[in-house]
């Protein structure tokens, strides 16, 4: 019967007694940077070309005995998970292996860099179809390794890496912390984060998604027909590399940004028990388990968005945090969040010719996060319209005044330390969907976009008194592009998007002694692209 | 994911203007930085990746590596160029004493230097 991990990543329509999704990734080459591998194992024979690349450190210890099967164990298993005949994800994918880890599973940053350079040179000498690079390894944060990954990604290569097995913030490790790399955490058959001895899967904002990574059956280097069960974020990353190979084989022109958005979109949502993660990491860690798309084609019509959290700003008075989208994504909205509630909002601003999302800490605050909503919007022309603080009782408002521009997000930023001490009523304008409204002492920023067929609407959900959390979701066929809170007073900790739901967090009324007039409203901006839908229908 | 350093340790080694008239001073106002792994047991001192500024050509990388070797030799230090990078990042991998870091950071075209460190199968 089908192993649990293959069943987990398979949409119901493909489930039979066998795992045989439509295209096995035959147009894609997957590079594996790992240990040596037993390339003639029955599960992978003919699928893996062992390159002559080898850059590994000496094994530790004077009495180390090099046993071939042990040297090959990690890499052979991963090659099997990616493309194995019977237990692999992308059965049609061809692989190339580079040896950067020694018989003890240890390598160096420099050896990995030289390996990545080897791949780039191979790509230049003999351009083939789409390339996926699997990096089932981790070291401490490395500026140079992250930079090399960035360069390779910008050359059109999809890099997939293990989040790390240290039960720690993945941002402290490389290449897991490289923004251009798809970073994968591990979950088990119960959709729980994987525990590995006293440690376990890494987590946090640098993880893109999770995938099966416990008790994964794959090729064993003990014999040519043997299988073994292994666990770790390497196994999880191998699943995503296989899924990526299949997606790219079906749609070879997909960019890295498009692939990442699809991986997120087709993942199983909200199935991971977040209680396993440290409390301060729960909001930052994506609750996503990778899965194959239900159909290999026809996803192009959707407006894809994802949420990108910044690093923590730190506690100083003027501290700021910046969240950035990938080069070919559009920043459609910007929000902020602070656990202490002390923040001075957020704003969208240009940096190096691209919009970024900047959040501002407040005096006495423990720090803030900036949260960017990053979307794929072809032929988009977006700009930010700002209204300075109105100082009048009606509050500050700003709208999209250019012809054909629609509102995709609202941000507000204030200089006063505590808006909560200034409590004028905020009047809600009705029938003006292209308008952002905020506190009279805040400057308001509207993200206004023009794109073929783009239409957006505002959805609100308010509750009379703060109860920790208010949510509002976009309905089927619409994508959440903007998420903000009204009125933005001191008991609002911030707003952020989780998949297609806008979440506004506030301090519990019982702890703040607030009055019921301070209603908290979650405001979602939901968009869709008629143009993308039409283009997709024409293709079909 | 963000490209900020987090807990990553960064040491900016000051340039002493009187030292090494031989070295071309880096462009005004840019100080090359030195980075090393925050996790001490994973550090591999003695091997360094010297990363050069983005548009540096291979020939300049090779010249910079040779210059480092020459200046190190003048001070009685042996160095070994293990690899010259080009294609992804301009730079070179060098085996040398940590005593030479200050000298290396003053070389022309140097953006930053990172001490090598271990990576592990996950």
């Amino acid at each position: 019967s089908i192993p649990w991990n293959l069943e987990r990543i398979t949409p119901p329509r493909y489930r039979a007694d066998e795992y045989q999704p439509p295209d096995g990734g035959s147009l894609v080459e997957v590079y594996l940077l790992d240990t040596s591998i037993q390339s003639d194992h029955r599960e992978i024979e003919g699928r893996v070309m062992v390159t002559d690349f080898e850059n590994v450190p000496e094994e530790d210890g004077t009495r180390f005995h090099r046993q071939a099967s042990k040297c090959d164990s990690h890499g052979t298993h991963l090659a099997g998970v990616v493309s194995g005949r019977d237990a692999g994800v992308a059965k049609g994918a061809s692989m190339r292996s580079l040896r950067v880890l020694n018989c003890q599973g240890k390598g160096t940053v420099s050896g990995t860099l030289i390996g990545l350079e080897f791949i780039r040179k191979s790509q230049l000498v003999q351009p083939v179809g789409p390339l996926v690079v699997l990096l089932p390894l981790a070291g401490g944060y490395s500026r140079v390794l992250n930079a090399a990954c960035q360069r390779l990604a910008r050359a059109g290569v999809v890099l997939v890496t293990a989040a790390g097995n240290f039960r720690d913030d993945a941002c402290l490790y490389s290449p897991a912390s490289a923004p251009e790399v798809i970073t994968v955490g591990a979950t088990n058959a119960q959709d729980q984060p994987v525990t590995l001895g006293t440690l376990g899967t890494n987590f946090g904002r640098c993880v893109d998604l999770f995938a099966p990574g416990e008790d994964i059956i794959g090729a064993s280097s003990d014999c040519s027909t043997c299988f073994v069960s292994q666990s770790g974020t390497s196994q999880a990353a191998a699943h995503v590399a296989g899924i990526a190979a299949m997606m790219l084989s079906a749609e070879p022109e997909l960019t890295l940004a498009e692939l990442r958005q699809r991986l997120i979109h087709f993942s199983a949502k909200d199935v991971i028990n977040e209680a396993w993660f440290p409390e301060d990491q729960r909001v930052l860690t994506p609750n996503l388990v990778a899965a194959l798309p239900p159909s290999t084609h026809g996803a192009g019509w959707q407006l894809f968005c994802r949420t990108v959290w910044s690093a923590h700003s730190g506690p100083t008075r003027m501290a700021t945090a910046i969240a950035r989208c990938a080069p070919d994504e559009e920043l459609l909205s910007c929000s902020s969040f602070s656990r202490s509630g002390k923040r001075r909002g957020e704003r969208m601003e240009a940096q190096g010719g691209k919009l970024v999302c900047r959040a501002h800490n407040a005096f006495g605050g423990e720090g803030v996060y900036a949260i960017a909503r990053c979307c794929l919007l072809p032929q988009a022309n977006c700009s930010v319209h700002t209204a300075p603080p109105a100082e009048a009782s009606m509050g500050t408002r700003v709208h999209c005044h250019q012809q054909g521009h629609v509102l995709t997000g609202c941000s507000s930023h204030w200089e006063v330390e505590d808006l909560g001490t200034h409590k004028p009523p905020v009047l809600r304008p009705r029938g003006q969907p292209n308008q952002c409204v905020g506190h009279r002492e805040a400057s308001i920023h509207a993200s206004c976009c023009h794109a073929p067929g783009l239409e957006c609407k505002v959805k609100e959900h308010g509750i009379p008194a703060p109860q920790g959390q208010v949510t509002v979701a976009c309905e089927e066929g619409w994508t959440l592009t903007g998420c903000s809170a009204l009125p933005g007073t001191s008991h609002v900790l911030g707003a952020y998007a989780v998949d297609n739901t806008c979440v506004v967090r506030s301090r519990d009324v019982s702890t703040t002694g607030s009055t019921s007039e301070e209603a908290v409203t979650a405001v979602a901006i939901c968009c869709r692209s008629r143009h993308l839908a039409q283009a997709s229908q024409e293709l079909q | 994911q963000e490209d900020e350093d987090g807990d990553y340790e960064e040491l900016v080694l000051a340039l002493r203007s009187e030292e090494d008239g031989l070295a071309e001073a880096p462009e005004h106002g840019t100080t090359a930085t030195f980075h090393r792994c925050a996790k001490d047991p994973w550090r591999l001192p003695g091997t360094y990746v010297v990363v050069l500024k983005e548009e540096t050509h291979l020939s300049q990388s090779e010249r910079t590596a040779r210059r480092l070797q020459a200046q190190a030799a003048r001070r009685g230090y042996l160095t070994k160029i293990l690899h010259v990078f080009h294609g992804l990042l301009p730079g070179f991998l060098v085996k040398m004493s940590g005593d030479l870091l200050e000298l290396a950071l003053k070389l022309p075209h140097v953006d930053y230097i990172e001490e090598d460190s271990s990576v592990f199968a996950q």
């Epitope: 390339s39 003639d40 040519s224 027909t225 | -």
Partner: antibody, heavy 115, light 109 residues
């Protein structure tokens, strides 16, 4: 092109041994092992075993375990199959084939065991 | 006694379609995605026609197709031609080895 070239026909007496060779070319040798298959006159195919060109590991069919030895010489890209204590029912055409997938076959070597 | 069971012979007229079955157990055919089909002419080595249940090697006519249901695999040849007359063998992985079927003689009438 991809080729497996086998040694010539052999006639052996019962109790003797035979060693058949198979030279591989045209593909990355370590990506595949070599399977050995035999076919008695007018009969079906019987898988005898497999040898790794990567590390020399072997996997023999239970029926021939103890009487067969497969070896490899990486310097000449040649694999050998030795069958000991031959009996008349070992008379067959012996084929080498690429890997477990057996997608490429040698031309066959006829081994006749007769007193 | 072969591990996989095939009909001893099948026949068909030119242009017709024929199907050859190959029945095993859950430990071989039913348990793996690696059923292959070989064509063999007298005095020649076998030639791979189908691998991994339903894949055709390059150069093999699309008249040849393979499928599997449970513990039985099938080879279908459509638009039968005179040159298809040959012996056909199936093979499958087992946990540690390989097994063949006894072979089916295809006669084109």
């Amino acid at each position: 092109q991809i080729q497996l070239v086998q040694s010539g026909a052999e006639v052996k007496k019962p109790g003797a041994s035979v060693k058949v060779s198979c030279k591989a070319s045209g593909y990355p040798l370590t990506s595949y092992g070599i399977s050995w298959v035999r076919q008695a006159p007018g009969q079906g195919l019987e898988w005898m075993g497999w040898i790794s060109a990567y590390n020399g590991n072997t996997n023999y069919a239970q029926k021939v375990q103890g009487s067969v030895t497969m070896t490899t010489d990486t310097s000449t890209s040649t694999v050998y199959m030795e069958l000991r204590s031959l009996r008349s029912d070992d008379t067959a055409v012996y084929y080498c084939a690429r890997g477990y997938g057996m997608d490429v076959w040698g031309q066959g070597t006829t081994v006749t065991v007769s007193s | 006694q072969s591990a996989l069971t095939q009909p001893a012979s099948v026949s068909g007229s030119p242009g017709q379609s024929i199907t050859i079955s190959c029945t095993g157990t859950s430990s071989d055919v039913g348990g793996y995605n690696s059923v292959s089909w070989y064509q063999q002419y007298p005095g020649k080595p076998p030639k791979l026609k189908i691998y991994e249940v339903s894949n055709r090697p390059s150069g093999v006519s699309n008249r040849f197709s393979g499928s599997k249901s449970g513990n039985t695999a099938s080879l279908t040849i459509s638009g039968l031609q005179a040159e298809d007359e040959a012996d056909y063998f199936c093979s499958s992985y087992t946990s540690t080895s390989m097994v063949f079927g006894g072979g089916t003689k295809l006669t084109v009438l």
